[in-house]
């Protein structure tokens, strides 16, 4: 089982453990080996203490266990004699956050350890480009996050503050949308969402390329490159090429780095180069027609980054077509 947790040591027998919503975790506790072991894990809020898990007289005692912990906790029974009183905690919820005390008594001594459990969540955010009538918007969206993240925007690497923030979920987890109006701008934009508890940061970067003017029946090359500053070599990512038309996006091609599989939804679309180095995802669109005019969007996304590259293609009638008219 993969247990995601961060251990922070602080004085006075107190540890801070950070877990992720819905995942499992171990609350650590060790003691000097001794016989006649008694273990009581308790949760304490401002008003009360609740029995999480007890062990004495050689077996787990769950008669007085609080119902919220039913079937979610266990001890490492075969390691108790070695001084391990750690608690295995399943399916973390935000309500599990708080102070836990582990009481251990033996024939030699009795001790109490304190563990502070903090629970975080950070579902991979998204950066979306939207056109509404004549306006263009960038939206940074995180569907589920806790605690409240720090969201920052940059325009051409300079921090900016004008953004519209929408938040749902009063106690958490939160769903957050941060929207920036970029109508008429040729600047590049960057949105960073940081979960300080989980020490996780996601960055979305948007770049508008110069407009491309092409003739009917020609082909166009649309560049899209993976910037090494953003992506580490072993990181899984996906590439999506789509076309924006009347505010609606339709997918043209899709690539998954984990399987190295490409799916094309438009027969005139192909990679510029073989994807040997997996860094250049430029595309060719052949046999252009007037209806191919519009905005083309390349989206390279991983757990930590989204890179959006926009190309505006103008297809003009060829000379022959023009003279025929």
């Amino acid at each position: 089982i993969f247990l995601s947790a961060f251990f922070t040591y602080v004085p006075m027998n107190e540890q801070i453990i950070i877990g992720r919503l819905g995942e499992d975790i171990i609350l650590p506790s060790s003691f000097e080996r001794g016989s006649e072991v008694v273990i009581h894990w308790k949760y304490q809020d401002s008003y009360n203490s609740y029995n999480v898990h007890s062990y004495y007289k050689g077996s787990g005692r769950l008669e007085s266990q609080d119902t919220r912990y039913a079937n979610r906790t266990s001890l490492f029974y075969n390691e108790i004699q070695n001084g391990n009183a750690s608690l295995f905690f399943r399916r973390l919820s935000l309500l599990d956050e708080g102070i836990y005390t582990c009481y251990v008594g033996t024939a030699i001594q009795a001790i109490t350890n304190k563990v502070v459990l903090k629970v975080g969540v950070f579902l991979t955010p998204m950066m979306k480009y939207e056109k509404r009538n004549t306006n263009s918007f960038l939206i940074c969206n995180v569907l589920s996050v806790y605690p409240r993240p720090i969201i920052t925007w940059k325009m051409d690497n300079t921090p900016i503050s004008e953004n519209n923030m929408q938040e749902t979920g009063s106690l958490g987890p939160f769903s957050i949308n941060s929207t920036l109006n970029i109508t008429g701008s040729n600047s590049s934009y960057e949105c960073t969402i940081e979960n300080s508890l989980l020490k996780q940061t996601w960055t979305g970067r948007w770049t508008m390329k110069d407009g491309l003017h092409k003739m009917q029946s020609e082909h166009v090359s649309l560049s899209c490159e993976l910037v090494n500053d953003y992506f580490s070599p072993n990181q899984d990512f996906k590439v999506t090429w789509s076309r924006m038309e009347s505010g609606i996006s339709s997918i043209l091609a899709y690539y998954l780095s984990s399987s190295q599989n490409t799916t094309f939804y438009e027969s005139r679309f192909s990679w510029n180069k073989e994807l040997k180095n997996q860094s250049d995802f430029s595309m060719n669109l052949t046999d252009l027609s007037l209806s191919d005019s519009g905005e083309y969007l390349c989206n390279i996304s991983s757990d930590e980054y989204t890179l959006l590259t926009i190309h505006t293609v103008h297809v003009e009638p060829s000379q022959e077509t023009a003279s025929d008219n």
């Epitope: 006649e36 203490s49 007289k57 005390t101 008594g105 033996t106 009795a110």
Partner: antibody
């Protein structure tokens, strides 16, 4: 070394109340369950009450249930037994006792006791 | 409630003797039994816990055995300091003491 010293005993009339105290030293009081045990001189021992290390659970012998209340003040390292509606059969030496931990375990240290006499 | 029956109630013996005190439970208490020694005017002192575990600092001439309902405390070679009253305690379900065995000099 572990020391338990009881006080508060005395002569009391039937139906009246009395509060016993036990001052603990030589160990981390808040880490141990504490009990009261009584003994009629020349007779046997009887367990009276238990309070868990954190005060979260309290248990009583049937003979005192509803009349006696066990409590603790960890900041003062003191155990208490509030006795009300006293009866002649409550006459005994009351001892404060430490459990080796806090899980219905055996007793490892006892105080000398304080005499309670219920008589009209 | 679990009843504890201790026997004999009085036992006369001499220094150097091997003596055995028995405790019987009214129902099984597994090994959750302790033995105590009490001298007049003094607090009881723990000798044995979990039926057979010797408390540290207690002389090895004391030993305990048994499980379920039958338990014994044995003093292999009586010393002058051992003359006292002995109690068993079950701690399987709440707490019950035996009525005590007074060990006196013959």
């Amino acid at each position: 070394q572990v020391q338990l010293v009881e006080s508060g005993g005395g002569v009391v009339q039937p139906g009246r109340s009395l509060r016993l105290s036990c001052a603990a030293s030589g160990f981390t009081f808040s880490n141990y369950a504490m009990h009261w045990v009584r003994q009629v001189p020349g007779k046997g021992l009887e367990w009276v009450a238990l309070i868990w290390y954190d005060g979260s659970e309290k248990y009583y012998a049937d003979s005192v249930k509803g009349r006696f209340t066990i409590s603790r003040d960890d900041s003062k390292n003191t155990l208490f037994l509030q006795m009300s509606s006293l009866r002649a059969e409550d006459t005994a030496v009351y001892s404060c006792v430490r459990e080796y931990s806090s899980g219905w375990g055996y007793f490892d240290y006892w105080g000398q006791g304080t005499q309670v006499t219920v008589s009209s | 409630d679990i009843q504890m029956t201790q026997s004999p109630s009085t036992l006369s013996a001499s220094v150097g003797d091997r003596v055995t005190i028995t405790c019987r439970a009214s129902q099984s208490i597994s090994s959750w039994l302790a033995w105590y020694q009490q001298k007049p005017g003094k607090a009881p002192k723990l000798l044995i816990y979990k039926a057979s575990s010797l408390k540290s600092g207690v002389p090895s001439r004391f030993s305990g055995s048994g499980s379920g309902t039958e338990f014994t405390l044995t003093i292999s070679s009586l010393q002058p300091d051992d003359f006292a009253t002995y109690y068993c305690l079950q701690y399987n379900s709440y707490y019950t003491f035996g009525q005590g065995t007074k060990l006196e000099i013959k």
